[in-house]
């Protein structure tokens, strides 16, 4: 028997991906777990083997399908169950009935390019990935640019409240190494958040032209 | 074998209410959504919504909402659908169907016809 | 509401012919899109679930292909047995959607 809190968390990617980290207090030498994801309305089930990513906490992502493939709708709900071998037996040890659109994480966003720069600004674009037609135009992203001697924390963070696959940088310094992320979330959803970071895309301002301020 | 039997044909007067049956077998009745849906003669189809046996919980066609209301009794694996202020326009067959990746099994439909 | 829109409304073909029928979706369903067969005076029986899949005991001769709004479904060659009225419907949203309908009869 297992003892102590737990807790089990999961986010749908929009498309065919749900991941869940689950966290539990008490040891579990050894013992094999895994989710396992049961919709209420279709025909698939899919199951994922718990793999440690802590001393108390285990993740995997239940692939339902191909990575674009639109396997859940606002109407599902799935049942999410985590399962530990006790010696012949599985044993349910979080239960959850999991609305995938009130829980969602999208990819990072990807394809950072520089579409131009100059000494003082510089745009740039990416693209979502595998992000559902449901959400037309409602998203929002957060972007955030490093520059030189500061940390990723300490940097600003700029807000697009709309679904924008660009951003103009002002004011930036010539001839300086700037890296640039960005993330994406939905509007939908209760329980909602942010996308990871983007791969941070690295570039350099124009240096000033001499002669001039 | 899945079954899903509907209680038989009905004659009401406009205004009243009526009630059908649909006692499902051969599946584990709290696990599946049970939708509900009519078809005038000669017409096509209208959901009309539909419920969850294991917690209860449903969904209803707002062109129905107020007028309709799904309940199961799962101790005898039976879903009921009743519509209420029957109009002469509700003279249909009513059906209820197991949903599973789309509607996979199906109850043999209901007349209901409404005349005073 | 999602508007399903079938085509065409009746169709003659012979035994052995390949019959197609479409179905549009006012908006994109994904591929949340099923077929149900049915014959005069009979119930409904699925066909095609989640647009491609064969339900169990469907004979091979029935397939369902598209993706977003456009959708077909093909019976590769007739049989006598196929003489009824097939129907689209999408599960993609609330309230569910049926197209009107396509009568299929033996010429």
């Known amino acids: 028997a297992v003892n102590g809190t737990s807790q089990f968390t999961c986010f749908y990617n929009s498309r065919a991906n749900i991941s869940c980290v689950w966290s539990q207090d008490g040891a579990l030498q050894d013992t094999s777990c895994q989710v396992h994801a049961w919709p209420d309305r279709r025909r698939w089930n899919q199951t994922c083997e718990l793999l440690p990513v802590s001393q108390a906490s285990w993740a995997c992502n239940l692939i339902l399908g191909a990575p674009d493939s639109q396997k859940l709708t606002t109407v599902d709900i799935v049942t999410l169950r985590v399962l530990c071998r006790e010696g012949v037996r599985w044993r349910v040890m979080a239960i959850q009935d999991f609305k995938p659109f009130e829980n969602l994480r999208l990819m990072a966003p990807i394809s950072l390019q520089v579409v131009h720069v100059e000494t003082h600004r510089c745009n740039i674009s990416w693209e979502i990935s595998q992000a559902s037609h449901y959400f037309e135009r409602h998203l929002e992203f957060e972007a955030r640019t490093l520059s030189p001697g500061h940390t990723w924390e300490e940097a600003p963070l700029l807000t697009l409240k709309q679904k924008q696959e660009w951003i103009c940088l002002e004011t930036l310094t010539p001839d300086t190494q700037y890296e640039f992320q960005v993330r994406v979330k939905p509007l939908q959803g209760e329980f909602t958040t942010w996308s990871p970071w983007s791969q941070p895309l690295a570039f350099r301002t124009k240096p000033a032209a001499l002669g001039k301020d | 074998q899945v079954q899903l039997v509907q209680s038989g044909a009905e004659v009401k007067k406009p205004g009243a209410s009526v009630k059908v049956s649909c006692k499902a077998s051969g599946y584990t009745f709290t696990s599946h959504w049970i939708t509900w849906v009519r078809q005038a003669p000669g017409q096509g189809l209208e959901w009309m919504g539909d419920i969850y046996p294991g917690s209860g919980n449903t969904n209803y066609n707002e062109k129905f909402q107020g007028r309709v209301t799904l309940t199961v009794d799962t101790s005898i694996s039976t879903a009921y659908m009743e519509l209420s202020r029957l109009r002469s326009d509700d003279t249909v067959v009513y059906y209820c169907?197991?949903?599973?990746?789309?509607?996979?099994?199906w109850g043999q439909g209901t007349l209901v016809t409404v005349s005073s | 509401d999602i508007q399903m829109t079938q085509s065409p409304s009746s169709l003659s073909a012979s035994v052995g012919d390949r019959v197609t029928i479409t179905c549009q979706a006012s908006?994109?369903?994904?591929?949340?899109l099923n077929w149900y067969q049915q014959k005069p005076g009979k119930t409904l029986k699925l066909l095609i679930y989640?647009?491609?899949g064969l339900h169990t005991g469907v004979p091979s001769r029935f397939s369902g292909s598209g993706s977003g709004t456009d959708f077909t479904f093909t019976i590769s060659s007739l049989q006598p047995e196929d003489i009824a009225t097939y129907y689209c419907?999408?599960?993609?949203?609330?309230?569910?959607?049926f197209g009107q309908g396509t009568k299929l009869e033996i010429k």
């Open positions: 989640y647009t491609s």
């Open positions: 419907q999408q599960d993609n949203n609330h309230p569910y959607t």
């Open positions: 908006q994109d369903i994904s591929n949340f």
């Open positions: 169907a197991r949903e599973r990746g789309g509607f996979d099994y």
